[in-house]
Interface confidence: low
């Protein structure tokens, strides 16, 4: 493929290969400038598969902290307001790059790690399995 | 709190301070072993706000593609299969983590960077805003 | 209206190589991913590979990896495949393709052939 | 890699439904998108449903596309058969990396 070429002022890396371990500055830039999380916050809510957020923390995780969404009724909530177990709310769930300490307990020293997490929940039309 | 001590095996860091550069190994572990991507796979067309995938590529960032959700219209779905506009479609948003190359071309120097993805769609009742 | 012109195909012998260029009009060349397919006589269709909008990412058919090069020049709104170490089953038509999203071949040139035979 | 299995060749009479199938061999074909591509012969092939069900402007209504999770397989349906409708019938599905056709089904409106 098209290869862009390397920067002369990158800093130097004794192992070229991949995978590798490399610089990160944890500084973190937000590109979200933009965005208004207020426009977003109360989804969970009005949601016709409402959902709860949890908390789940490790020290030892960068960041420490993620928020989990767990649907609040196995199935969706009609015009009425009542459950209509017809129908079904299921987690979106999405893979993040996270960073894990490697060794443990090491300020300076992380190794990427995919996790999974469910984001919200959307209400979909269930699988129907028909007996032959 | 509790003070985990420093590991004594841990890579020597000029700096001590937050934010600090750090070394990530990008070989990355994947925690998702137990998970089945077949069950969340197809929510997208079966939701009652059903959205579109679409690829986002960035060759300056790591994870350099990442899918976009766009929702397929502005209301949902309702029983008979139609468009319900008393319903709104709306995106789940998440914050995510990524590493940007920094410099720019870099393979070996990366800063975090937070950006704003939306993982899916999700059907809310919507806010009326009534006219005095 | 979306127009794709494929040039650069003929007989070639194996081993040899050849350039294929697609001339682009009636879009934004560089806000779309590209695509080559191949079709065999009388056979099936056959993804070949694939480059993102700003030429930054490179996609391959494992049949083609190390021999094949697709490149693009925004500028000339072309899209180019470098063939080299050519083989007999190489031999098809040749169509460049514009991405409605990755992997969904939205609109297709007319196609250019390449033959390889001694 | 995966692989997508089409009947070799389907026939109907005018004014009647067929409806063609794909199956993937391996992988959940609910993951990505299928699409699917009319080719006459001696033309370049052309799209005819993309995102499993979605048609672009200008083909009729009389073709629709669907895909059943349970058998890892979608499917092209053409109602109203027309005579212009034969012509070879390509799905076609994709990971991150590769895109994949199946292998083509031939329609004879009888």
């Known amino acids: 493929g098209i290869t862009i070429p390397r920067n002369p002022g990158c800093p130097n890396s004794e192992d070229k290969n991949f995978p590798r371990t490399v610089m990160v500055n944890l500084n973190i830039h937000n590109r979200n400038t933009n965005t208004n999380p207020k426009r977003s916050s109360d989804y969970y809510n009005r949601s016709t598969s409402p959902w709860n957020l949890h908390r789940n923390e490790d020290p030892e995780r960068y960041p420490s902290v993620i928020w989990e969404a767990k649907c609040r009724h196995l199935g969706c909530i009609n015009a009425d307001g009542n459950v209509d177990y017809h129908m079904n709310s299921v987690p979106i769930q999405q893979e993040i790059l996270v960073l894990r300490r490697e060794p443990p307990h090491c300020p300076n020293s992380f190794r990427l790690e995919k996790i999974l997490v469910s984001v919200g929940c959307t209400c979909v039309t269930p699988i129907v399995h028909h007996v032959a | 709190g509790i003070t985990i001590p420093r590991n004594p095996g841990c890579p020597n860091s000029e700096d001590k301070n937050f934010p600090r550069t750090v070394m990530v190994n990008l070989n990355i572990h994947n925690r998702n072993t137990n998970t089945n991507p077949k069950r969340s796979s197809d929510y997208y067309n079966r939701s009652t706000s059903p959205w579109n995938l679409h690829r986002n590529e960035d060759p300056e960032r790591y994870p350099s593609v990442i899918w976009e959700a766009k929702c397929r219209h502005l209301g949902c779905i309702n029983a008979d299969g139609n468009v319900d506009y008393h319903m709104n479609s709306v995106p789940i948003q998440q914050e995510i983590l990524v590493l940007r190359r920094e410099p720019p071309h870099c393979p070996n120097s990366f800063r975090l960077e937070k950006i704003l993805v939306s993982v899916g769609c999700t059907c809310v009742t919507p806010i009326v805003h009534h006219v005095a | 209206e979306v127009q794709l012109l494929e040039s650069g195909g003929g007989l070639v012998q194996p081993g040899g190589s050849l350039r294929l260029s697609c001339a682009a009009s009636?879009?934004?060349?560089?806000?779309?991913?590209m695509s080559w397919v191949r079709q065999a006589p009388g056979k099936g269709l056959e993804w070949v590979s694939a480059i993102s909008g700003s030429g930054g990412s490179t996609y391959y058919a494992d049949s083609v990896k190390g021999r094949f090069t697709i490149s693009r020049d925004n500028s000339k709104n072309t899209l180019y495949l470098q063939m080299n170490s050519l083989r007999a089953e190489d031999t098809a038509v040749y169509y460049c393709?514009?991405?409605?999203?990755?992997?969904?071949?939205?609109?297709w040139g007319q196609g250019t052939m390449v033959t390889v035979s001694s | 890699n995966f692989m997508l299995t089409q009947p070799h060749s389907v026939s109907e009479s005018p004014g009647k439904t067929v409806t063609i199938s794909c199956t993937r061999s391996?992988?959940?074909?609910?993951?990505?998108?299928v699409q699917w591509y009319q080719q006459r012969p001696g033309s370049a092939p052309t799209i005819v449903i993309f995102a499993n069900n979605q048609r672009p402007s200008g083909v009729p209504d009389r073709f629709s596309g669907s895909i059943d999770s349970s058998s890892n397989s979608a499917s092209l349906t053409i109602s109203r058969l027309k005579t212009e409708d034969e012509a070879d019938y390509y799905c076609?599905?994709?990971?991150?990396?590769?895109?994949?056709f199946g292998g083509g089904t031939k329609l004879t409106v009888l």
């Open positions: 393709a514009r991405d409605l999203i990755w992997g969904v071949a939205g609109s």
């Open positions: 391996s992988g959940s074909l609910a993951n990505y998108y």
């Open positions: 009636g879009f934004t060349f560089s806000s779309y991913a």
């Open positions: 076609q599905t994709y990971d991150p990396y590769s895109v994949v």
